[in-house]
């Protein structure tokens, strides 16, 4: 297993609709490779997998239909979008990139993006 550098933004603020987007960039030493991107959430020293996708470098990446993540890829960059976030989902979201095949296998883990989610204030009832 060889190490690979992965870069991602330090902080992202989710939109009022609970959507957060960030770029995960990896320094790939190989050519066309099967790549696996995993988003991990770290909160209170617990790490859980949010979503994962495997794709061919240069092609689109597809998450499972029921995934809360969507994304596009361009070269060595993956543009990730996480939806349906609520205040309780605030935490550190880590991008993990694996160059799966062919060997050599490379693994890179970013420092994480702190995503802040603020639940929108409920709209006050109004008389028309």
């Amino acid at each position: 297993c060889k190490a690979m550098h992965v870069a991602q933004p330090a902080v992202v603020l989710a939109s009022s609709r609970g959507i957060a987007s960030f770029v995960c960039e990896y320094a790939s030493p190989g050519k066309a490779t099967e790549v696996r991107v995993t988003v991990l959430r770290q909160a209170d020293s617990q790490v859980t997998e949010v979503c994962a996708a495997t794709y061919m470098m240069g092609n689109e990446l597809t998450f499972l239909d029921d995934s809360i993540c969507t994304g596009t890829s361009s070269g060595n960059q993956v543009n990730l979008t996480i939806q349906g976030l609520r205040a309780m989902d605030t935490g550190l979201y880590i991008c993990k990139v694996e160059l799966m095949y062919p060997p050599p296998y490379y693994l890179g883990i970013g420092n994480g993006t702190q995503i802040y989610v603020i639940d929108p204030e409920p709209c006050p009832d109004s008389d028309f």
Partner: antibody
């Protein structure tokens, strides 16, 4: 013990296509990558490409790009190699072989399929 | 893609040893411990004899051993037997080509 069994010999006309099958038994089809290698008469081994049976993703040797297609049918644990625009120098024995993701070993190998291209 | 370089032939008397070399570059043989060796008898499929430079699959006699120094890998067959007469190929992944490369092949003759 995993076994790979390939389809029988083929005789093809120049310009046509050939499709070879490689059926896996005795183990999980989707956990290891399938590679294809060919050997022309009296020549050495030549790697053609790989396929991930789990995702269907493929990678090809540069010289075969555009002429080779690797596919699979996971329901019958079978991988396929299709080679198009056949020429006489494509006459060879074609082998499939299994490769764990983080290893350089090809094991086991199919018994081979002889493809003869002749008019 | 360019093949790894092997001597075309090697020979030895029964009971003696023979060593086959496989020379590549830092992108393949020298860069990773992925070198495998395959034995091929006429009309048969290749058989894995050594993988990851030194490892032997179960069922392969311990007369077969592998090693590596720099960009050159070697296969040694000690205590040669008649059934060891075959073609031997090295193979490894090439990190710059993202391809598997084989050696040119060595015909081993037991005298």
């Amino acid at each position: 013990q995993m076994q790979l069994v390939q389809s029988g010999a083929e005789v093809k006309m120049p310009g046509s296509s050939v499709r070879i099958s490689c059926k896996a038994s005795g183990g999980s089809f989707t956990t290891h990558f399938i590679n294809w290698v060919r050997q022309a008469p009296g020549q050495g081994l030549e790697w053609m490409g790989w396929m991930n049976p789990n995702t269907g993703n493929t990678g090809y040797a540069e010289r075969f790009q555009g002429r080779v297609t690797l596919t699979r049918d996971t329901s019958i644990s079978t991988a396929y190699l299709e080679l198009s625009s056949l020429r006489s120098d494509d006459t060879a024995v074609y082998y499939c072989a299994r490769n764990p993701a983080e290893s350089g070993r090809f094991d086991p190998w199919g018994q081979g399929t002889l493809v003869t291209v002749s008019s | 893609q360019s093949a790894l370089t092997q001597p075309p032939s090697a020979s030895g008397s029964p009971g003696r040893s023979v060593t086959i070399s496989c020379t590549g570059t830092s992108n393949n043989v020298g860069g990773y411990n992925y070198v495998s060796w395959y034995q091929q008898h006429p009309g048969k499929a290749p058989k894995l004899m050594i993988y990851e430079v030194t490892k032997r699959p179960s069922g392969v006699p311990d007369r077969f051993s592998g090693s590596k120094s720099g960009n050159t890998a070697s296969l040694t067959v000690s205590g040669l037997q008649a059934e060891d007469e075959a073609d031997y190929y090295c193979g490894t992944w090439d990190g710059s080509l993202n391809a598997y490369v084989f050696g040119t092949g060595t015909k081993v003759t037991v005298l």
